[in-house]
């Protein structure tokens, strides 16, 4: 086109329905120019106008010839243009922010605007740019894009933004623009102009100077604090550490904390100082609640449920910022809240939930919540299977009879629908405890009763009880212990009895042992001893306990002696023993040696012995009657170990084995023995009976049994040349090759002739006795042989 004609035709649209086309007027034309615009399309349309732009309906795809005639005072000129949608620019109208508001407590800006979508013929994607600026100098803080869709009608859009800096700290400005990304439009698409700016600023009050106030934030976060001040701020500190100041408008300043550390329970202090003042706030840096750990629900009484949990990682937030817990039961919709005053015991928290009638299965959700977040744990529980009974109380023991008692106790709760398994601990003094399990039907009134049999009469028992439900979850704690003495019963056995004839053979001495407590069945008060023959029964006077011996004058006829023990309830069965022994001519005295503490005696089985065997023992050196103690063993035994605290090593004891038939005893074996053999304590006394020029006859005496201290096994006789009171070596000293030793193993030998000696020579003689326990001391003598004749 010529310069003298209309030129530079451009078309724009803001709604895709109308194109706004404008051109530049020919140079030199004034105001009074008219234009004729003709558009060559299906119907040839021409428009008369007095300005350099025209709004035309959007043309469909394809090229169109546009003719513009300019009619002015000094003639006319015509320009032809080819117009295509691709030459048209889509520039949306400048958007307008309808509303900008702020929530200062969360430092959040809220934006509201209209997309004016009703003017667009079809759906289009819209890109919005939102610009946030801060401070009077309008520093760009954030530029964000936000996508929406036009849907043929006007739509209100909302957008919010959380500021990293409290909104109180500085003025904040917001402006928006848009870009319509229409798929149906092939022309150039451009951004709208920026909307008129809107701002938010804080109206300072007289008090608060530092923001944010009392904020709770996550450990590791970044946070900005500011101080609104009329006077110059000199410094800022978090805790005791200084922070560089960021200058805002006027005297206002800010600081930025990166990766904040966990706070103490009193929070972290943030302060700003001026010449004369300090302004501060407290920040609480902590953690959201951890998932409650080990959530467990149980009941003590089937009336209320106790749920316990561990809070897990500490949040570092206390007081009003501490974690609050709510326990919700989803079947019933009921819930209970944890009161902060209920301080956790040993790091574990607990809540009580009232049980609901006819509900056994509970679905609990424990919600944990603090200002930084929430978490939860769930548990599904059949509460009848999670009964942890209270400790049984009011535990009592009452007698039924001498072998049975009645136990009663109190177990709070309504257990009518379940069974209990209770464990009773039964402890007898000085013996191991026994435990018995009993199943008991639960009751509503909390009182329980059980009978306990198979006890021993007159025995001190200590009882205690604990219970669990039959399905077993947990044992209750043990009840208090109750000590109880069962009542007496008739003694179950007669005393263990023996008899000995007195040394003069005129009196029979009857001995018996006190009944063990489990056979006495009570306190033994006395004993009855009676003596019967075919003709008569003679009863001695009652012998009070603790006397365990009676003496009867008897002839040598055979009598049956009976001993009966009596307690407050009655008399024992009689213990019977014949006064006379069944003779046995075929007896040798045997030697036996023990094993340090006791002595093992063995014998052959004898079917004739029908009652029992008795082993009797005594100290060999004691006078008659020989009785130190006796032991009864069953008739089917063939060995026993005899042990006694009275046994001493090196002391000789007599042991007698008796067999019994029809209450009569026959001596089967007679033994002498030692628990342990020792070496003799003395040497044999010896003398020289005869001396010649070449021999000496020595004679010695027996060592008394008490000093022998074992079975004599032989003598050691040493001899060699030697003189009294000289420096010459003694016979027993080592290294002498001329010493001769004789081992005399025939213990009946009491003399020894030493031959082949030299005449008129001094000899040193030494004699020692030995047992299996060792060699005894020496006895020595010096003898001079006669002169050769």
């Amino acid at each position: 086109q010529k310069k003298g004609a209309p030129h530079d035709l451009k078309c724009v649209t803001n709604n895709l329905q109308v194109w706004d086309c404008y051109w530049k007027a020919p140079s030199g034309t004034g105001r009074g120019t008219d234009y004729e615009v003709c558009i060559e399309n299906r119907s040839h349309s021409c428009y008369q106008l007095e300005k350099t732009n025209i709004k035309i309906p959007a043309l469909s795809h394809g090229d169109y010839e546009i003719t513009i005639n300019s009619l002015h005072d000094f003639g006319s000129s015509t320009s032809k243009f080819t117009l295509n949608e691709q030459n048209v620019s889509l520039i949306p109208d400048t958007p307008e922010i309808l509303n900008l508001s702020a929530d200062f407590s969360t430092s959040t800006l809220y934006l509201k605007w209209n997309d004016r979508g009703s003017v667009f013929p079809h759906h289009s994607n819209v890109i919005w740019e939102i610009k946030i600026l801060r401070k009077e100098s309008m520093e760009l803080v954030k530029l964000v894009t936000h996508n929406t869709t036009l849907n043929g009608k006007d739509t209100l859009h909302h957008w919010s933004w959380a500021s990293d800096m409290p909104l109180e700290c500085a003025i904040h400005f917001v402006e928006i623009r848009c870009y319509i990304d229409s798929l149906h439009f092939s022309g150039r698409k451009e951004w709208s102009d920026w909307s008129p700016v809107k701002n938010i600023s804080w109206m300072p009050d007289s008090q608060t100077k530092v923001f944010p106030q009392d904020k709770v934030i996550l450990v590791g976060s970044d946070i900005t604090f500011c101080c609104i001040s009329q006077e110059k701020v000199l410094s800022a500190l978090i805790g005791h550490t200084n922070c560089p100041l960021i200058h805002l408008d006027g005297e206002n300043v800010a600081i930025k904390i990166h990766n904040i550390s966990v706070s103490a329970s009193s929070g972290t202090n943030v302060v700003f100082t001026t010449e004369d003042n300090i302004f501060g706030t407290v920040i609480f840096a902590g953690y959201p609640p951890d998932t409650p750990q080990q959530l467990n629900c149980e009941t003590h009484d089937l009336k209320e449920i106790l749920c316990r949990w561990n809070p897990g990682r500490a949040t570092a937030l206390v007081g009003p910022r501490a974690t609050s817990y709510t326990l919700l039961e989803s079947f019933s919709g009921k819930y209970v809240r944890f009161k902060r005053a209920e301080a956790p015991t040993n790091g574990s928290y607990q809540l009580f939930f009232q049980m609901l009638p006819n509900q056994e299965i509970y679905n609990f959700t424990l919600n944990a919540h603090n200002p930084l977040g929430r978490s939860e744990s769930t548990i599904l529980v059949n509460i009848t299977e999670k009964v942890y009974p209270h400790t049984p109380t009011s535990f009592k023991v009452k007698d039924i009879n001498s072998t049975a008692v009645k136990l009663s106790w109190h177990l709070p709760g309504n257990f009518a629908k379940i069974n209990f398994l209770c464990q009773i601990e039964i402890k007898k003094s000085n013996t191991v405890q026994e435990q018995r399990n009993v199943t008991i039907k639960g009751v509503e009134n909390s009182s329980y009763l059980v009978a306990l049999d198979k006890l021993n009469p007159y025995t001190v028992y200590t009882f205690r009880i604990r219970c669990s439900t039959e399905t077993f979850w947990k044992w209750s704690k043990w009840s208090n212990k109750k000590q109880h003495l069962t009542t007496e019963a008739i003694p179950s056995k007669g005393p263990d009895t023996w008899r000995e004839w007195s040394s003069d053979g005129k009196n029979l001495i009857i001995y018996w042992k006190p009944l063990p407590i489990n056979e006495a069945n009570g306190k033994i008060l006395s004993y009855n001893v009676s003596c019967s023959s075919d003709e008569e029964t003679q009863s001695l006077s009652e012998i009070p306990d603790p006397q365990h011996k009676a003496e009867i004058q008897l002839d040598k006829n055979d009598y049956i002696i009976s001993v009966v023990a009596k307690n407050s309830v009655g008399s024992s069965p009689p213990s019977k023993i014949a006064s006379m022994e069944i003779p046995n001519d075929d007896l040798k005295i045997e030697q036996v040696v023990g094993m340090g503490k006791g002595i093992l005696l063995t014998w052959h089985y004898d079917p004739n012995m029908t009652c029992d065997y008795v082993i009797k023992w005594c100290n060999s050196s004691r006078s008659e009657p020989c009785l130190m103690d006796w032991r009864k063993v069953p008739s089917n035994s063939t060995e026993t170990v005899i042990e006694s605290d009275q046994f001493r090593p090196g002391v000789r004891y007599n042991f007698f084995l008796y067999g019994c038939r029809n209450q009569g005893y026959q001596l089967l074996r007679s033994m002498i023995g030692y628990i342990e053999e020792l070496a003799p304590t003395v040497a044999p006394n010896f003398t020289v009976e005869d001396t010649s020029a070449d021999s000496i006859l020595v004679k010695w005496e027996d060592i008394p049994v008490e000093e022998l201290r074992g079975f004599l096994r032989g003598y050691l006789f040493y001899f060699g040349k030697g003189e009294r009171d000289t420096s010459k070596m003694r016979v027993l000293e080592s290294g002498r090759s001329d010493i001769k030793v004789k081992n005399i193993t025939d213990i009946s030998q009491k003399t020894l002739r030493i031959a082949d000696l030299q005449g008129k020579t001094s000899y040193h003689l030494v004699l020692r006795a030995y047992t299996d326990g060792g060699v005894g001391p020496e006895k020595s003598m010096y003898v001079v042989t006669k002169e050769n004749s």
Epitope: S235, L237, H240, N242, P244, S266, V271, T273, E275, I278
Partner: antibody, heavy 116, light 107 residues
Framework: QVQLVESGGGVVQPGRSLRLSCAAS????????MHWVRQAPGKGLEWVAV????????YYADSVKGRFAISRDNSKNTLYLQMNSLRAEDTAIFYC?????????WGRGTLVTVSS | DIQMTQSPSTLSASVGDRVTITCRAS??????LAWYQQKPGKAPNLLMY???NLESGVPSRFSGSGSGTEFTLTITSLQPDDFASYYC?????????FGGGTKVEIK
């Protein structure tokens, strides 16, 4: 470990000068305001001077104003106190302490004796 | 300058006693008060700041209270390690000023 160690104390005549140093270790020295506090023998604590974390501000007690100068070298993690025109009443243990407002870490002190 | 007055200057007490030390400011200092402990021959040690905040590592038997001009330091159950001198300090404005000190000694 975190510590402050003072040095430079000693016996000096009245009217003379002395320079105290305080070496910091185990923490970010440049993030803390630093003080000098003194304690005359058998007496209480007396604040002497403070310097801002970046050295931008300094304040002094009236008793030392014009005679003492506090300074710091953050690159060397060191605090200084230049003491001029010393007087007998300046005799004290001088402590350096960390923290602009509250002193949460103290050195063991260095004794300055002003005596003729 | 803000003057700090501490009382008593000396206090005799036994292990297990509850001990209270008072500090007064000549003008309001809000809560900008610290307490220090000093043992003979040693440097002071920070116990409490902002009147009632316990410094990390300080036993919980120490507590502080007060605001404005009246402040107290309390030791609930005196331990052998607590026999020392105690100083209050205001840090509301420069110059920082200390109280005259309270010596807690064994009765």
């Amino acid at each position: 470990q975190v510590q402050l160690v003072e040095s430079g104390g000693g016996v000096v005549q009245p009217g003379r000068s002395l320079r105290l140093s305080c070496a910091a270790s185990g923490f970010t020295f440049s993030s803390y305001g630093m003080h000098w506090v003194r304690q005359a023998p058998g007496k209480g604590l007396e604040w002497v001077a403070v310097i801002w974390f970046d050295g931008s501000l300094k304040y002094y007690a009236d008793s030392v104003k014009g005679r003492f100068a506090i300074s710091r070298d953050n690159s060397k993690n060191t605090l200084y106190l230049q003491m001029n025109s010393l007087r007998a009443e300046d005799t004290a243990i001088f402590y350096c302490a960390r923290g602009q407002l509250v002193q949460d870490l103290w050195g063991r002190g260095t004794l300055v004796t002003v005596s003729s | 300058d803000i003057q700090m007055t501490q009382s008593p200057s000396t206090l005799s007490a036994s292990v297990g006693d509850r001990v209270t030390i008072t500090c007064r400011a000549s003008q309001s200092i809000s809560s900008w008060l610290a307490w220090y402990q000093q043992k003979p021959g040693k440097a002071p040690n920070l116990l409490m700041y902002k009147a009632s905040n316990l410094e990390s590592g300080v036993p919980s038997r120490f507590s502080g209270s007060g605001s404005g001009t009246e402040f107290t330091l309390t030791i609930t159950s005196l331990q052998p390690d607590d026999f020392a001198s105690y100083y209050c300090q205001q840090y509301k404005s420069n110059p920082l000023t200390f109280g005259g000190g309270t010596k807690v000694e064994i009765k």
